[in-house]
Amino acid sequence: DAHKSEVAHRFKDLGEENFKALVLIAFAQYLQQCPFEDHVKLVNEVTEFAKTCVADESAENCDKSLHTLFGDKLCTVATLRETYGEMADCCAKQEPERNECFLQHKDDNPNLPRLVRPEVDVMCTAFHDNEETFLKKYLYEIARRHPYFYAPELLFFAKRYKAAFTECCQAADKAACLLPKLDELRDEGKASSAKQRLKCASLQKFGERAFKAWAVARLSQRFPKAEFAEVSKLVTDLTKVHTECCHGDLLECADDRADLAKYICENQDSISSKLKECCEKPLLEKSHCIAEVENDEMPADLPSLAADFVESKDVCKNYAEAKDVFLGMFLYEYARRHPDYSVVLLLRLAKTYETTLEKCCAAADPHECYAKVFDEFKPLVEEPQNLIKQNCELFEQLGEYKFQNALLVRYTKKVPQVSTPTLVEVSRNLGKVGSKCCKHPEAKRMPCAEDYLSVVLNQLCVLHEKTPVSDRVTKCCTESLVNRRPCFSALEVDETYVPKEFNAETFTFHADICTLSEKERQIKKQTALVELVKHKPKATKEQLKAVMDDFAAFVEKCCKADDKETCFAEEGKKLVAASQAALGL
């Protein structure tokens, strides 16, 4: 359905408030260094222009594409070359190359100051003084730090952010009311950003087919009562939504996501029995709720998969006629029967099945060749099961902090070239799998753990892609999306690594560590641990544990001392000397 003016169409569909919010997100995700005021000015100009097009769709420039309009607007920024360097060259290009150029310059790790949370009273005053600006600032700050954040979902976060301030700034104890809510939004926001980043990486690095396969598996687990044709329709629509958002087409994305939520709710009888509550909610809550809805119950008496996919005489005929559809049916049937498997495992099984058919259907006796294909699945299923069992046992034995440390050591030895902040961030997140997933019963552990690990390892991949330093990381990240985790698991100690020169400065600590939060103190200690392993990759667990225990005791002692700084200086020297001796440095 072609519209005379795309900008007028989206303005009318979304309404002024959502239109302005989404344009702000889009601009902040592209120009991540621009000041807030500059973005607000650009958004207001675009909004005023959109209103003229709503009034008269034939008005000048109203027929231009959104990319043309937005790109032209971004290219009016005066300091583009000084602030962004070669990104300014994008403005010399024509659409669609210009937009592609902007996308390529999105920075997953922008050089921006950490967001420091002001005092509660200061925040409440700012909220009451100018609610609109306060909420816009939230959108801007999140969007520029998370350039792939799922825009319609960010609107939902902003709505919750506003509700938290509306409620808590009137409360007797503002801080007790507000701070837990803000912590929850921060943690959920980081998780949401990372999940969306994987979807965009999947689409951009491995293509639409890879994303669709992921979506078939996940939606089939979630909606096992839905027919294959219904799941296929949802997958097609969902792929369009995420392709748009990942491509910076945020207005279209939000509009299409709303349409998809509407369709799902209108057809919930043929999709899932779990959607009722979601579908009673307002739009943003509804879409979020559908995306998080629990798996429906599996239909009773599902027949054996072997009948259609191994025993049938038509396997090769059906496969040859419509390969992706037949593989999609296989994935759908397998996934709806296995909510206990991770999506990536299901995709590995489908890939194995595909490889077998490719080989066997060209053989003299196809059936004889593929008859035992399901036997090939056994080791693929057992590998993540065993890994999760072992790691959950280790987590239960050590607790989260020490489990993270075990992973820090493990991953630093695998890929010691990776920067210390990245190793700390990624290993800490890998370690969170324990508290997130090990509490679940067996049937929920694998989908929780392995699909979460896929999200975390993607963070490593996108951060590493910006400044590649390890061929092993590049290999695991680029060869196969579904085999990333097994690829990293299989890495042993990098024997080619030349240990880092010892630098006492790296292990010099000051009294400021005493005022840090527990989390920040852990990060300091974990940073030291990574550096230690980089200096002495062959250090044993026992050696590292002894040094870390000494370090913890040293911090505790000096933080209790009257003259903390002197303690850190003197005891620090002793600690460094003792550690060098213990590790044979």
Epitope: D314, C316, K317, E321, A322
Partner: nanobody
Framework: QVQLLESGGGEVQPGGSLRLSCAAS????????MVWVRQAPGKGLEWVST????????VYAESVKGRFTISRDNAKNTVYLQMNSLRAEDTAVYYC????????????????RGQGTLVTVEP
């Protein structure tokens, strides 16, 4: 839109040969499996043969195995059916077909099909 144009049919004596061609357009031929089906007078559609997108996989109905050969030329967007040792029971209208999104695999009534080409085998 999808277009399939069959040619090469005609009258032939039992034991004779014919080569059918099907020129395709309006879709990505090189990523699509192709099928030959036939309809004998007063009968329903009968599947004859299938070839995969890359031509690595070919499958035949028992009734034509060893006599018919399916092939394709992705550069020319054309699929072929070489028919040897023809029999009276091979008399039918032969259709070239390809999968239509949303249809059931093997439900040939729902596939994209051409107009067909008539093959008559009689002494």
């Amino acid at each position: 839109q999808v277009q399939l144009l069959e040619s090469g049919g005609g009258e032939v004596q039992p034991g004779g040969s014919l080569r059918l061609s099907c020129a395709a357009s309006g879709f990505t031929f090189s990523t699509s499996g192709m099928v030959w089906v036939r309809q004998a007078p007063g009968k329903g559609l009968e599947w004859v043969s299938t070839i995969s997108d890359d031509a690595r996989i070919t499958v035949y109905a028992e009734s034509v195995k060893g006599r018919f050969t399916i092939s394709r030329d992705n550069a020319k967007n054309t699929v072929y059916l070489q028919m040897n040792s023809l029999r009276a029971e091979d008399t039918a209208v032969y259709y070239c077909a390809t999968y239509r999104a949303g249809s059931r695999i093997g439900s040939y009534e729902d596939y994209y099909r051409g107009q067909g080409t008539l093959v008559t085998v009689e002494p």
